[in-house]
Amino acid sequence: DFGLDCDEHSTESRCCRYPLTVDFEAFGWDWIIAPKRYKANYCSGECEFVFLQKYPHTHLVHQANPRGSAGPCCTPTKMSPINMLYFNGKEQIIYGKIPAMVVDRCGCS
Amino acid sequence: DFGLDCDEHSTESRCCRYPLTVDFEAFGWDWIIAPKRYKANYCSGECEFVFLQKYPHTHLVHQANPRGSAGPCCTPTKMSPINMLYFNGKEQIIYGKIPAMVVDRCGCS
């Protein structure tokens, strides 16, 4: 499995992973105790036919070309969790692993 | 986890799973012995803000709105394998489980 990594100034047109730091305080998400900021990353770019396609299925749908099907799009293909300390709806403090908070790899699907 | 199911005549605009039968013979993929056809399904539709977003990460990127980031797109969020009998590059007959050949659920990511 392979994915491109780019920096925030790159003019790369293909599907790529870009750095993004999420700042919960800046968003006003005051129920999150820690971390206040974390490296989330994001996916952006074009999915030309075949490039970085994660699944054979993507190729098959492209060939079949059914009504309404868009081309593949640049989306996370591998994600990882982070540990967070936060208030739940009952004002209890919770420490837990929140899945799929960090993009580790991007691809076309 | 939740995803919409639609049929091919549906006027649903949101991200939805649609039926699609892939016919290997019609594609000229003669190295596939069996199955000759299978139900692959595909994803199509709009990803309006929040609807069917699989990960909180998607929401966070939307809020951060970094340079070049597109909105979330309708993509498989759950896939399953199928068993296939096929010729490999060395003309050997292989029986194996091929991952991510069927879309079980669609969502916005």
């Epitope: 003019t11 047109s13 770019g45 074009e46 640049c74 | 340079r67 070049g68």
Partner: antibody
Framework: EVQLLESGGGLIQPGGSLRLSCAAS????????MSWVRQAPGKGLEWVST????????YYADFVKGRFTISRDNSKNTLYLQMNSLRAEDTAVYYC???????????????WGQGTMVTVSS | EIVMTQSPATLSVSPGERATLSCRAS??????LAWFQQKPGQAPRLLIY???TRATGIPARFSGSGSGTEFTLTISSLQSEDFAVYYC?????????FGGGTKVEIK
């Protein structure tokens, strides 16, 4: 023949809005990123904005961010630039330009339109 | 942003002579550099992309060289139609940036 034809320029008061259009022909429009580049009278070239072939990704110069919006209609082979909160310093000839796709990087403009003049003045 | 500096601002050359135009980037742009020619009242025209590759229909007297931060456009034997303003432009990083231009005039 590959052609780009801009329209929509004119005289507008500061704070006003204008929408520029660029009609493309002679190539598969949806396969190419498109950009707007401007040139103030007697000055050099200045990049304004770029949009990917699919329209999914957009990029802006800091001086227009939040004021200008680039978009495209691939079914009409047309590129747009919506310009709001116009200032005197936005006075320029606005060119639309096609990406040459010479490598995987956006930004090498192989075809340019003839330009449309935007004058912001009271 | 990457600042592109062109020199000289004006170059006076006689027809048939060689012209050498320079472009310097404030940081590496690899080979993601283009050269454009612009005549009064006209749109720019792409001459060179990828620092050294001539665009379609561009005469062989135009050549580009360099990579990283130092680039050169050479016109081997100036023709009357070559008197114009020349711009370099980097497309390695956002924002895309142009040099201030070099005016090539008749000596």
């Amino acid at each position: 023949e590959v052609q780009l034809l801009e329209s929509g320029g004119g005289l507008i008061q500061p704070g006003g809005s204008l929408r520029l259009s660029c009609a493309a022909s002679g190539f598969t429009f949806s396969s190419f990123a498109m950009s707007w580049v401007r040139q103030a009278p007697g000055k050099g070239l200045e990049w304004v904005s770029t949009i990917s072939g699919s329209g999914g990704s957009t990029y802006y110069a800091d001086f227009v961010k939040g004021r200008f919006t680039i978009s495209r209609d691939n079914s009409k082979n047309t590129l747009y630039l919506q310009m709001n909160s116009l200032r005197a310093e936005d006075t320029a000839v606005y060119y639309c330009a096609k990406d040459g796709r010479y490598n995987w990087n956006y930004g090498a403009f192989d075809i340019w339109g003839q330009g449309t003049m935007v004058t912001v003045s009271s | 942003e990457i600042v592109m500096t062109q020199s000289p601002a004006t170059l006076s050359v006689s027809p048939g002579e060689r012209a050498t135009l320079s472009c310097r980037a404030s940081q590496s742009v690899r080979s993601n550099l283009a050269w454009f020619q612009q005549k009064p009242g006209q749109a720019p025209r792409l001459l060179i992309y990828g620092a050294s590759t001539r665009a379609t229909g561009i005469p062989a007297r135009f050549s580009g060289s360099g990579s990283g931060t130092e680039f050169t456009l050479t016109i081997s034997s100036l023709q009357s139609e070559d008197f114009a303003v020349y711009y370099c432009q980097q497309y390695n990083n956002w924002p895309l940036t142009f040099g201030g231009g070099t005016k090539v005039e008749i000596k």
